[in-house]
Interface confidence: low
């Protein structure tokens, strides 16, 4: 296992002391019920918690709310349950924090059931004041923010009733009725989905698709026989039922739903779905599930406009009872997702790729870890990653996988080692390549999380005991110091940092136990003194991104361009600071055919970077709806992939020509569509 | 469909062997464990063990260790059951069933045994 | 191993009537518990997987809860094709072991 505190590690130097100065309680005049945290902004110190505690009576439920303000990360709290008027919150609906640092917090209130409508209490100065404002509806869903403008929201009704206030809130509007589901897209347009006969249940399938760029005062109807819609990126997505039978197909849309194109994927049926499980403006990753209640499906990538997809992995885990996916997003590093497939023997394995989906590899055995009981061959086996799945399944996993954009290379996981992920207690392994290479860091399961961009890790192991234990290392996981945070130990239930890992505060959150009662408490711990110095120049190492072979020429390209950045050494001791910004070096690369995914027809035969005809379309001229015409590829089987940068080097040739014709299977053509104004 | 058919009734005698098949039929026999149940006259299930198909590994209850040997062809998709020096109290019904599930591996659903064969009776009597 | 318990050994019920049979497992099997339905002369019959999920056309009048330790399966409305031995498993862990069974008869 990685060296624990022992000759290897330099121990920093005089940190219980540092800590102890450092350290902050506070307990929580609360019976123990639940507690929620919401930071309000970015830099600001502003954390808002609410308490709530249920008592069960007879004939009904007495409920009682806390709200509660800091301005110095969690070190101290003051009670402002006056300024909301002592009102009980509806937990369920959370905290609504406005976008950025717009500083607006929407509380939803619970109402006595007679009343005409609900209740909201609005901040927009950080939670230093709220104003009550009485509901003309009930709501149903957690008030939502345009993403353009704060003071633009909309909120569905139990009624199902779509309604949007103009002005954070204080005035509502009802701008549409029967509405199934609303989402904000850019320039303040709203899509919404509407039923016309019983019910959005009874009319799944025969729903139709709505947008408003005006807040209201105009509609056009974008499509019908609407299933569901979604948002990724910059393409809207709907899932379009099939004229004959009970079978439904995504169309994808990259005007806000002027014109929509059938998406080259497979149709699906009465129990099966589709799901967007990440996207950029470049392009898409959709999971489209098999047939039969089988937890699998296959993923596919798209190309630029979201039409073309490529298979991309097979066997893609995605249980349909819980919905569950391990699809994870590496965020420190460019073009890293993790998965888990199911293989053939019904065991779980997880998948890797370093180039947006182009191939997917097992995870590199740990170094200094044995292969465990599930591997047949004890020399060979891979890093298994436990993540929503294994939570799901209720094993010994406290935390999903961990990567932070601005603590480049860093990824933080529950995993086990062998040819399939395990039941038995997993370890907590770190990689600092982005998912390369990978080490043991913690020898069982722990919470974890980044502080100082990567300068800093904590980590709290996770027991049934109250604990009174952090261990925190400067070293990106080599090396560990542990502190004792407190002589009376705590159930632990939570460890909460600032959201974008800039923060070097920590909060501890969990809750004492006596005799006739049960308290909330937080133990915020800064580390500012445990990196005593800024960092330099001289604290920095150059690092290439992506680098397997430095002998090739090539070494580091991914998706066309090679990125060098600026790392902090791990034997620095030093702040990163609020204000670090990662310092990337980019370079563009020639062009291989590893920049290229199979076109339409084609596909890559494992350990293969040529691609080849599909044998079911030889011969077959391939063709595709296109904005609802017929269109003519003619291609020799590849396409760049969208957001590669490459340039010269291969150049294959793709050409498409429009047959002039229109497509049967596109419900979604702009004869279909209608506007209407209010 | 999918299907489990085993092989007909055999009469034994004490001290011998007895090899039941299990032919699979209607999926990918390599996908699936298959495990062995028994259910002797008026008695409830017991479990006997499983096969990997795809890699042949097996596990078996403490109980039949020494005694029970399962193995599987993979061509014609059949698994097989031998349990030897039978004593009087091995006269049951033995099952074949597909499962999902592993000790050590996180297998989706740990399903249970969710097709069955139809049985095959043995009797042992001197 | 787990030793899994299920009470009653015998249950009698009208047609029509509801029927919530009990399964004890020795230690902590999560969800990962089956129950089956055996006629007599019959194989066992898959049920509920997952502790709670249907199987394949299985009746909605079948549903299991429970999770850890203890578990039920409920008959909410007998009818006469249910009258049967119930089974549970445990999916946990080798060996799989099963409880030993309630009979549900007529009452």
């Known amino acids: 296992s990685a060296p624990g505190e022992d000759e290897e590690c330099g121990r920093v130097r005089d940190f219980v002391a540092k800590l102890a100065n450092n350290t902050h309680q506070h307990v929580f005049d609360d019976l123990r019920g639940s507690v929620s945290l919401s930071w309000v902004g970015d830099s600001t110190g502003v954390i808002l918690v609410l308490t709530t505690f249920h008592v069960p009576l007879v004939i009904m439920t007495f409920g009682q709310s806390k709200l509660y303000r800091s301005e110095d990360y969690g070190k101290n709290f003051k009670d402002i349950t006056d300024l909301i008027n002592n009102t009980f919150i509806r937990t369920e609906f959370g905290m609504a924090i406005g976008p950025e640092n717009s500083g607006k917090v929407v509380l939803t209130a619970e109402v006595s059931g007679g009343s005409r409508g609900g209740r909201i209490f609005r901040s927009s100065d950080f939670a230093k004041n709220f104003v009550q404002t009485d509901l003309p509806f009930h709501p149903l869903t957690q008030m939502m923010y345009s993403p353009q403008n704060s003071d633009y929201l909309l909120a569905l009704s139990t009624e199902n009733g779509l309604w949007v206030s103009k002005n954070f809130g204080g005035k509502w509007e009802e701008i549409h009725k029967a509405v199934c589901l609303a989402k904000w897209g850019s320039d303040n347009t709203i899509f919404f989905t509407t039923y016309a006969n019983g019910s959005c249940k009874a009319d799944l399938g025969a729903l139709e698709l709505w947008r408003t760029s005006d807040l209201g005062k105009s509609f056009k109807t974008i499509g019908v026989k609407i299933y569901s819609f979604g948002l990724g990126g910059r393409f809207l997505f709907a899932s379009v039922m099939a004229d004959k039978d009970t079978t439904r197909r995504i169309h994808v849309s990259t005007d806000q739903g002027d014109t929509w194109s059938m998406a080259q994927l497979p149709s699906v049926g009465q129990e099966q779905f589709y799901s967007i499980l990440a996207a950029n403006d470049d392009m898409v990753f959709m999971h489209v599930d098999e047939p039969g209640d089988t937890g699998f499906g296959t993923i596919f990538t798209s190309d630029d406009r979201g039409i073309v997809y490529s298979k991309s992995l097979d066997r893609h885990l995605y249980t349909t009872t819980g919905g569950e996916t391990d699809f994870t997003n590496v965020t420190s590093l460019r073009g890293v997702y993790i998965t888990s497939v199911l293989s053939e023997d019904n065991s779980i394995q997880t998948m890797i790729t370093f180039d947006q989906g182009g191939r997917w590899t097992h995870l590199r055995k740990p170094e200094n870890s044995e292969c465990d009981a599930t591997a047949k061959n004890k020399n060979e086996c891979s890093l298994h990653i436990h993540a929503s799945y294994s939570i799901s399944q209720k094993l010994n996993v406290p935390m999903a996988p961990l990567s932070e954009p601005n603590a480049v290379g860093i990824v933080i996981a529950h995993g086990s080692v062998g040819d399939a992920i395990s039941v038995m207690v997993p370890d907590v392994y770190i990689s600092d390549d982005g998912g390369y290479s990978w080490t043991k860091m913690l020898e069982g399961p722990h919470y974890y999380t980044i502080l100082d961009s990567g300068g800093i890790i904590v980590a709290i192991e996770h027991s049934s005991r109250p604990i009174n234990v952090i261990k925190f290392s400067t070293d990106e996981g080599q090396c560990w110091q542990t502190y004792t945070f407190t002589r009376d130990p705590i159930y632990f239930t939570g460890l909460a940092s600032e959201p974008g890992a800039r923060s070097m505060n920590i909060s501890i959150w969990g809750f004492t136990e006596s005799f006739l009662t049960s308290q909330w408490v937080s133990y915020t711990i800064d580390f500012k003194d445990i990196l005593e110095r800024n960092c330099e120049e001289k604290d920095y190492t150059i690092w290439l991104a992506h680098s397997t072979d430095p002998e090739d020429y090539e070494d580091g390209c991914i998706l066309g361009y090679k990125e060098q950045f600026l790392r902090l050494r791990k034997s620095s001791v030093c702040q990163n600071g609020r204000d670090y910004v990662v310092t990337k070096q980019p370079s563009i690369c020639l062009c291989s055919l590893e920049d290229f995914l199979c076109d339409f027809g084609y596909y890559r035969p494992e350990n293969d970077s040529k691609c080849v005809e599909q044998p079911e379309l030889k011969g077959h001229d391939l063709e595709f709806c296109l904005y609802g015409r017929e269109e003519h590829l003619t291609t020799n089987g590849y396409r760049k992939i969208p957001g590669d940068k490459c340039q010269g080097g291969v150049n294959p040739v793709r050409e498409v020509k429009d047959l002039k014709k229109k497509c049967t299977s596109n419900f979604l053509s702009p004869e279909k569509q209608n506007s209407k104004s209010n | 469909q999918v299907q489990l058919v085993q092989s007909g009734a055999e009469v034994k005698k004490p001290g011998a062997s007895v090899k039941v098949s299990c032919k699979a039929s209607?999926?990918?026999?390599?996908?699936?464990?298959m495990h062995w149940v028994r259910q002797a006259p008026g008695q409830g299930l017991e479990w006997m063990g499983s096969?990997?198909?795809?890699?042949?590994?097996?596990n078996y209850a403490q109980k039949f260790q020494g005694r029970v040997t399962m193995t599987r062809d993979t061509s014609i998709s059949t698994a097989y059951m031998e349990l030897s020096r039978l004593r009087s109290d091995d006269t049951a019904v033995y099952y074949c069933?597909?499962?999902?599930?592993?000790?050590?591996?996180?297998?989706?659903?740990?399903?249970?045994?969710?097709?069955w064969g139809q049985g095959t009776t043995v009797t042992v009597s001197s | 191993e787990i030793v899994m318990t299920q009470s009653p050994a015998t249950l009698s019920v009208s047609p029509g009537e509801r029927a919530t049979l009990s399964c004890r497992a020795s230690?902590?099997?999560?969800?990962?518990l089956a129950w089956y339905q055996q006629k007599p002369g019959q194989a066992p019959r898959l049920l509920i997987y997952?502790?709670?999920t249907r199987a394949t056309g299985i009746p909605a009048r079948f549903s299991g809860s429970g999770s850890g330790t203890e578990f039920t399966l409920t008959i909410s409305s007998l009818q006469s094709e249910d009258f049967a031995v119930y089974y549970c498993?445990?999916?946990?862990?080798?060996?799989?072991?099963f409880g030993g069974g309630t009979k549900v008869e007529i009452k």
């Open positions: 069933a597909r499962g999902v599930g592993s000790t050590v591996t996180l297998a989706y659903y740990y399903y249970g045994m969710d097709v």
């Open positions: 209607g999926y990918t026999f390599t996908g699936y464990y």
């Open positions: 096969i990997n198909p795809n890699s042949g590994g097996t």
């Open positions: 230690q902590s099997v999560s969800s990962n």
């Open positions: 997952g502790a709670s």
């Open positions: 498993q445990q999916v946990a862990n080798y060996p799989r072991t």
